[in-house]
């Protein structure tokens, strides 16, 4: 089956959600782990990740079509300490499959705002920290 991973971000007030989405077939969920790393160029693993999600096969989902599983990492207030390069990854303990998403970055600027770059073009985000709105 075709398995892929995508990264996205969304903002709710001052909160920034970093989202790792894995598309997979229902039967491939078992043994899969999705994880998010920061500033890890070569050693991104569940053990070195900020957060991980172990997928479970959901018997309630009918059919054999593609389904998605999401790991969401929420930062309540982005600070300069969050500046860095992030990557969504996934691996299967059963099949040995390893997925690595594109690198994306959070940059906290001197004006007190921050930008998220490296996501799909429509998801290049620029946030005003104080206002908590898209600028």
């Amino acid at each position: 089956g075709c398995i892929n991973i995508t990264s996205s971000a969304s903002q709710e007030g001052t909160r920034l959600n970093l989202i790792c989405t894995v598309w997979h077939k229902k039967e491939e969920a078992e043994g899969f782990v999705v994880f998010l790393c920061k500033d890890r160029s070569g050693d991104c693993s569940p053990e070195t990740s900020l957060k991980q999600l172990r997928l479970k096969r959901d018997p309630g989902i009918d059919g054999v079509g593609e389904i998605s599983s999401q790991l969401m990492f929420t930062i309540s207030q982005v600070t300069p300490l969050h500046s860095g390069t992030y990557q969504c990854c996934a691996r299967s303990q059963k099949s040995g499959i390893r997925l690595q998403g594109h690198f994306f970055s959070i940059l906290f600027t001197e004006t007190g705002n921050y930008t998220v770059t490296g996501l799909k073009q429509r998801q290049h985000l620029e946030f005003s920290h104080n206002e908590g709105t898209l600028s």
Partner: antibody, heavy 119, light 107 residues
Framework: EVQLVESGGGFVQPGGSLKLSCAAS????????MAWVRQAPKKGLEWVAS????????YYRDSVKGRFTISRDNAKNTQYLQMDSLRSEDTATYYC????????????WGQGVMVTVSS | EIVLTQSPTTMTASPGEKVTIICRAS?????MHWYQQKPGASPKPWIY???KLASGVPDRFSGSGSGTSYSLTFNNMEAEDAATYYC??????????FGAGTKLELK
Amino acid sequence: EVQLVESGGGFVQPGGSLKLSCAASGFTFSNYGMAWVRQAPKKGLEWVASISSGRGNTYYRDSVKGRFTISRDNAKNTQYLQMDSLRSEDTATYYCVTHNYESTIFDYWGQGVMVTVSS
Amino acid sequence: EIVLTQSPTTMTASPGEKVTIICRASSSVSYMHWYQQKPGASPKPWIYETSKLASGVPDRFSGSGSGTSYSLTFNNMEAEDAATYYCQQWNYPSMYTFGAGTKLELK
């Protein structure tokens, strides 16, 4: 169990130097921003400096900029605070603390180490 | 720099009494955190992001507020609650600031 153990405190004259260390265990040290928070005798808490995970970017309160240097050694699971040109107003208990990654609270604190600056 | 002013500075409460501690910010802030510190001990996270209880904190405690006014409340004062409580916030560029503390004693 998360443990933060500070060392290196002591008595020093104004203008002198000290280097504090904080040995961390029980968590993936390299993933977390670290900081120092101090408390003067019978006084409140005061953030001193922070260092980010990854690139190790550093941030300081205005009163210590140019005098204090925060650093970390991820291989040794240790963070440091080099304190130079010490003043009497730097006298305090210095706590090693971890930054919560998802929030702006300091979630783990060491037992603290006393620094006394006096002639 | 945002200044946090706590009131009262010190207070005495009887067992079972309802206690409220106020933290006022000089400008609007997004969240307030609270710590408990007992004599000779390190501070402990008590409430984070205004209203969420830290791990192990009894549910008689609660936090609320928005803008420039935040509060820490506990419904039934117990002997173990006697401590100093500090509020804390983050903003840019002054980063992390704390209130001066409220010392709570058992009557």
